[in-house]
Structure formats: structure tokens, C-alpha cells
Amino acid sequence: EICGPGIDIRNDYQQLKRLENCTVIEGYLHILLISKAEDYRSYRFPKLTVITEYLLLFRVAGLESLGDLFPNLTVIRGWKLFYNYALVIFEMTNLKDIGLYNLRNITRGAIRIEKNADLCYLSTVDWSLILDAVSNNYIVGNKPPKECGDLCPGTMEEKPMCEKTTINNEYNYRCWTTNRCQKMCPSTCGKRACTENNECCHPECLGSCSAPDNDTACVACRHYYYAGVCVPACPPNTYRFEGWRCVDRDFCANILSAESSDSEGFVIHDGECMQECPSGFIRNGSQSMYCIPCEGPCPKVCEEEKKTKTIDSVTSAQMLQGCTIFKGNLLINIRRGNNIASELENFMGLIEVVTGYVKIRHSHALVSLSFLKNLRLILGEEQLEGNYSFYVLDNQNLQQLWDWDHRNLTIKAGKMYFAFNPKLCVSEIYRMEEVTGTKGRQSKGDINTRNNGERASCESDVLHFTSTTTSKNRIIITWHRYRPPDYRDLISFTVYYKEAPFKNVTEYDGQDACGSNSWNMVDVDLPPNKDVEPGILLHGLKPWTQYAVYVKAVTLTMVENDHIRGAKSEILYIRTNASVPSIPLDVLSASNSSSQLIVKWNPPSLPNGNLSYYIVRWQRQPQDGYLYRHNYCSKDKIPIRKYADGTIDIEEVTENPKTEVCGGEKGPCCACPKTEAEKQAEKEEAEYRKVFENFLHNSIFVPRPE
């Protein structure tokens, strides 16, 4: 029986009965928050062989091993993951071993086994036989291995039953528990699974099989399952579903959801039955099961029941996330906020059409309206009194409407009104009239030339750069000395710069009146010598990174015709020089024969330029004599099992942490202080743990249903 879609067992251990007839869990399996220690010995689910998503165990008191619960769990597919993990075992206070002795394959994702104070038999499992890549596994804060004394079957009797593999240069027996070996298939099978008798399964099998070379005898399928057979691809008129089986159109049409309406049911796209059209596609009509590509961003119509949506905070803007067409009116009233411009762009940046009017008033936090970066049409189907469809009143810091060189905005019906916007130049408003097609609609009082732009440098001259020099982490720029009509009106210059991977930034990007600004700012005083051109050295930059830079002259206010005369440059794009890349990551080496080494690595996190090749160096090392001093055939006295507290030790502390023998005749000395890199790594590690724990808690703690 296929169970799903996802099973959550919590609070009451008797809920485990829900798994009774499951052979495949289509979705996830959560077993968590069972605080009363119970006897799980009567619970056994031998039918369960596959979990298509992930397995999560969290705070289940009294459970000592998973082997009795799931003796035949063979594959966890990881089609969807829990924070990148397909197997999570977290804060399982009584778990002594994992014991999933039939687990042969975790198809996607890593494992996270953390803060399990009594958990042993972790170093005896070779996860590389189960997962493709072990580098992302996270196994910390469990019982220290030296307190476990993990023994594989037969070791004490000197008749070892398990096979050996090498992990971290340690060649050892591999087992799940004191009486269960880790199964390994003969090398002749290659990547194929095998039966209990070591016969190779059919190539389409995954994990195991009941008969050799038979695609109907697989425990799980490598690709897809259809009508009792493992197939490499779904046959005609069937569709991939949940990453593991083939279903027909009727099946797909009959999947229900409590979250969405029946007209938003599953769709068939690109040979797959899926919950919704993928990014960039939309349903081919409201009653269709099929997807077609969107032209531009996919449309999402949002409607306000009260006709007018007031945006007075990030929270209210959040309701418009993803909307491309807004049916109603927008009233923007942002008086304060943190990082408001980029937050608004995040939530309102896709809006293309507003069917009613747009009113911006008392929005003192706004410097620009560029957060509405895709607005192209205001229909004006509903207008404010006086027939206004675009109304801008009393915005003390508004300096820019949009970047009209890169913006087409049409106002289909209605007039514009602008008043009491002291930093908004009238020329900017006139430009909007031309672009939007509203020129001639406004009457004289609709655009007030006295109280718009009264405190702005509206008649701007252009500053020209004269030279630029770059190194790997510095840029030197100079520009023409600006000479206003009265030299005393020039106070200083401000240089603005930021990383700009693409040449599409504007002066007002990410800028608001509450201090948030995506640009770095540096003040540059006037050179005392009137003939010297002003300039600046920007340092601490990243190698091989494109920066955008512009300069503004800072001038005294109220100069000509009661308006400020100012100057600024165009935006200059400039790239720093290349530099030495950081070290390649995750270097792994393994020997696959007596004369070969296979070395793998990931690219450096900071390439600092275009990588063209890698240099691999190697040298022969003398054999370490220490390896011969110990008789590895004798098993030393097994350490006493001491209960660990489940906290995470960053390092194992010796008896006397203050003194370490530092070699030679130096005698005892203090432990070496941690390097900055080590401290940073520890800090990041702790941060990563916190992020995961928050994610876990946020995912699993839900309010009780009423």
C-alpha cells in the first residue's frame, strides 16, 4: 500500500499504527515529540521499504533503535528534502543505534545526526555506500566514539562477520549494530544492487531485489515504477509523479488539496504530473491541466476587497508578493521603515498594471518610486476626486519618480497631481508627463512649480571623470573640478560606489530616507590647490569585481531662482584586476588501484578571476612507522559506556587542558591559541547549527487544530 502524502506522527506513539500497511511512503515520515518513554518492541513495520522524500526523527523518548521499527527500509529517495537532508535524527535522547540494517540507498540529499546523547554505531557505518556524496553529512554532538566501544558482529569471538571498508584512512569493519553487518554487494555488480545471496539485481533496481536480473523483483526502482515493473522512463500516456512512479491522466486529475481550489489542481507538464506549472509557465486556461510559457513574468492577478490597498508597512506590501496585475487602487503611505526600498521592491516589484489609481502621500521614507520597477500601466478605471489617477502629495524626501531612460509607463485615463514634494524637481514631473502620455491633461494647479523641488539641486551640471586606475583591490578615480557660478558655494564631493555585476544600476537603487542605502559613500574634501583635480582611492575592494561609481558635488542651498544648482557624474562601471584564487574546496583523494589515485575537488569559493586550469602536485610520502607499533588484530579493552550530555564539543578536552607537551625538551606549555580562521570557522559552524535548529522548530511546531 502506498501511504501519503507525508505522514506526521507526534505526541502519541500509538499513531505509529498508521504505518501498518505501508510499503511506500509517498512523501516524508516525521516521528517526533513523543515525550513519554514507551516500549516500542511491539511496533514493527516490515512492509515499509521506501520513503520518497525524507525521514525525520526528533525527541522520541524511549526509542533505542530504528531497526525493529523499520527492518526493511531500503531506500530514502530524497525527492524533497528537509533543509538539504534526507535523514535527520535530532535530539533522540534514548537512541543507542540507528540500526536501519537494510538501508542501502539515499538517492538525494545528505544526513544530519546531531545531539543524540546516547547514540553509537555511527563510525561503523560507511555512508559512502548509501549516499553519492558524504561531504555534506553532518554528524556531531552524539556519544563520543571512544565511549561507545562499537563492536561489529563476531569481532569479540575473533570471527568477524562483516566486511571492511576505508573511511578517513581507517580500514575497518562496517556494521549497524552489535549483530547486524552493513550489506555490501560484490564488486562484480558495479553500481547495481544485489540480493541477500549476493546475486546482482536488474540495472533498474535500487537498493535490493528478491530475484536476480529481474525488473519485476526490485524492492525499489532506480528510475520509475509502473504496473509492477521498474522502467527507465514512463511509457506513453503516463506521467512521472513524485519522482518515483508513473501515473495516468485520470490519476493526476483526481489529486485533491485542502489549500487550493479544484480549478488549481495538479497539472501535466513536460511528462510530469505536478502540483503547479513550473516557474515561467502558466495554465492554458482556467480549466486546463496543461501549461504554456508565460510572455514575460507570469501573470498573477491580485484583488483588494475594499478596492483600495493601503501600503503603510512592509507587512502590508508582503500581501502583494508575486502580483503582476493589481485590481484596485494603491495608496502608498510609508512614513518610516528599515531597508524599506529593497523590501518594497521585493514585494511590489512585479506589479505591471494597476487598474485604478495610485496615490503616494506622506511617504517620507521614500526617495524614489523605482521599487515599482515593472509598473507599465495605470488604467485609471477608478479615479480620485478631481479625476486624478496618479497623485503625489507631501513626500519630504522623494527625489526621483523612475529612471525615465529605461521606463515606459502609460496612464490610460485620469490626470496627475503633484504638491509639497520639496526634493522632487519639476523637470522630473514634466518628463513623466511626456512618458506617460498625460501631457495636456493637467491644469495649471495640478503641478505646483513652487513647492515641488524647492529643496533640491534641480539644475544639475555633469561631472566628468578624468582618469581611472585599478589594482586587484583598489580603484583610483579623478574627475574635473566643478566650478559653480560662485566658487564658495561648492563644499565637497561625495563618491558613491557599490558592487554591480550588471550595468543596470540607478542612483536610487535600495535607497530610502531612513538611512538604508545600497551604495557605499565616501566624502572627498576639495583639494586646497585650485588647479588639482579632485580624486579618491577606493580600497578594500574585491578582486575581479565590477563596481558602479558616481560622484556628486555638495553645494550650498538656494542659489539661483530659489533653486539649488548642483552637479553629478554619470554612473561609471569599472572592474578591479584579477587576483590569486582562494584554495580549491573539499579536496578528496582515494585509491582505486595499486597504481592510481583519484583526486576530486570543488572550485574555490573566491575565483577572483576567470579560472582557466588547476595545478595538481603530489609527492611520495615515507610510510609512517607508527602504524606498525600497534597490534591491530587485538581488540583493546572496551571503554566503559558513559552517558554523554548531547552537547557539542568543539574539541576533545584532555585531562589537563592547560598543559600540552610541545615536543623536544620544551616541557609543558599552553595550548596554541586558535587562529582567526579557526575562530571564524567555529563561529560559522555555530551559526549554521542555530539556523538549522530554527528551521527545524519553525517547521514542526504548529498550533493545535481548533
Epitope: G4, R249, D250, A253, N254, I255, A258, S261, S286, M289
Partner: antibody, heavy 118, light 107 residues
């Protein structure tokens, strides 16, 4: 011929249990969502539960926690396990496949009577 | 849950006349509304699906209209076999719900 044949109704005491069955034929049972609908004597239709093709189950508030819908695709059968029965559960129970956006197919069982009385 | 309210509760019409039945939803359900006919001792029979889509085998005197919250079933000329109880049913959101029914009787 597409049909649904019901069984399992009868007289039961309050607090008792009963299991209704519905056997499907003439269509690919596993590819369709299946519903239970009931009708109390002289009253209107009341939707009570559905199980979709994945096995996901949904219930009306009036039966949540007491009734369990399940299916066995190998046997082409739909079930309704009714526990903690009350007098107000007395009704004719229908199993049905209700059409959806993409199909007009709408199939109902003949109905089976459940009487809850002491 | 979405509540469906049918009106009138009973409709008395003469054969050959037109009958108009109404169904109102407590919130917008798009076009996910269906009309059923039920005769005594029988299981319901689907007449109209998704507000206005007719089904094969159903006489074309039955038609449906509406979307959002207001829906109508129209029987253009009542035949003797049309006297029955009519139910609307929404499938837009789970749990599904039925209206309380409209009884169409001979005047």
C-alpha cells in the same frame, strides 16, 4: 459498465461501530478520487468524506475523528469505518466518484442505510 | 467551510413553464458549482457541472449560469419527469458542501 455496489449498512447502537464497503467496476478505480455522501431521512445531501488518488483523506467537521475513509486499489474497494456512532448519523450513505474539471464522469452507488438507535 | 444557500425552498410550477432555481455561495467559488437532480428512493444525478457545462444524456432544457457567488439553474420547459429535488454542490474548496435543496413541485 461503470458501477459502484455498496454493502455493510444496518442497525447499530449509539457508540457502536460499522464498516461500509463500496466495490467498483468498469473503470480504473485507482485513478479516481472517491467520496462518501449521506442523506438523513427526509433531509438533504451531506458530503462527508473523500480520499484522493494519493490516499490523502478529507472529512466534514461533523464526522472528523470518528469516521475513517480508506481504499484498497488491489481490490477496487472503498471503505468507511464509522466509530462512536450517534443517532444523528442515521442516514442513507452513498459512495460516489464525483466528476472534476476535466471529466464529466459522475458515478453513485445505490446507497446503504445505517440506523443508529438503542 | 463554504455555505450554499438555495432559493426558493419549494418552487410550484406548471408543466411546460420555465423554472429558475438559485444558489448562493458564502464566498467566491469561481465556477466550481454543480447541479444535481434527485428523485425519491434514487441516488442523485448530475445535470450541470462547473456552473454551465452541460453533460451528454442530459436534456438541453437544463442550463446553468453564474460564477463567483451567484448561480442559476434554468429549466426552460418543465416536463412531468422534471419534478424532483435539485441540489447545488461546490467542489471549489474542501470540505465539499451541498445546498439544502429546492423542491420543484407541480402547481
Amino acid at each position: 459498465e461503470v458501477q459502484l455496489v455498496q454493502s455493510g449498512g444496518g442497525l447499530v447502537k449509539p457508540g457502536g461501530s460499522l464498516r461500509l464497503s463500496c466495490a467498483a467496476s468498469g473503470f480504473t478505480f485507482s485513478s479516481f478520487a472517491m467520496h462518501w455522501v449521506r442523506q438523513a431521512p427526509g433531509k438533504g445531501l451531506e458530503w462527508i468524506s473523500v480520499i484522493d488518488t494519493r490516499g490523502a483523506t478529507y472529512y466534514a467537521d461533523s464526522v472528523k475523528g470518528r469516521f475513517t475513509i480508506s481504499r484498497d486499489n488491489a481490490k477496487n474497494s472503498l471503505y468507511l469505518q464509522m466509530n462512536s456512532l450517534r443517532a444523528e448519523d442515521t442516514a442513507v450513505y452513498y459512495c460516489a466518484h464525483l466528476g472534476n474539471f476535466y471529466y464529466g464522469m459522475d458515478v453513485w452507488g445505490q446507497g446503504t442505510t445505517v440506523t443508529v438507535s438503542s | 467551510e463554504i455555505v450554499l444557500t438555495q432559493s426558493p425552498g419549494t418552487l410550484s410550477v406548471s408543466p411546460g413553464e420555465r423554472a429558475t432555481l438559485s444558489c448562493r455561495a458564502s464566498q467566491s467559488i469561481g465556477s466550481s458549482l454543480h447541479w444535481y437532480q434527485q428523485k425519491p428512493g434514487q441516488a442523485p444525478r448530475l445535470l450541470i457541472k462547473y456552473a454551465s457545462q452541460s453533460l451528454s444524456g442530459i436534456p438541453d432544457r437544463f442550463s446553468g449560469s453564474g460564477s463567483g457567488t451567484d448561480f442559476t439553474l434554468t429549466i426552460s420547459r418543465l416536463e412531468p419527469e422534471d419534478f424532483a429535488v435539485y441540489y447545488c454542490h461546490q467542489s471549489s474548496r474542501l470540505p465539499h458542501t451541498f445546498g439544502q435543496g429546492t423542491k420543484v413541485e407541480i402547481k
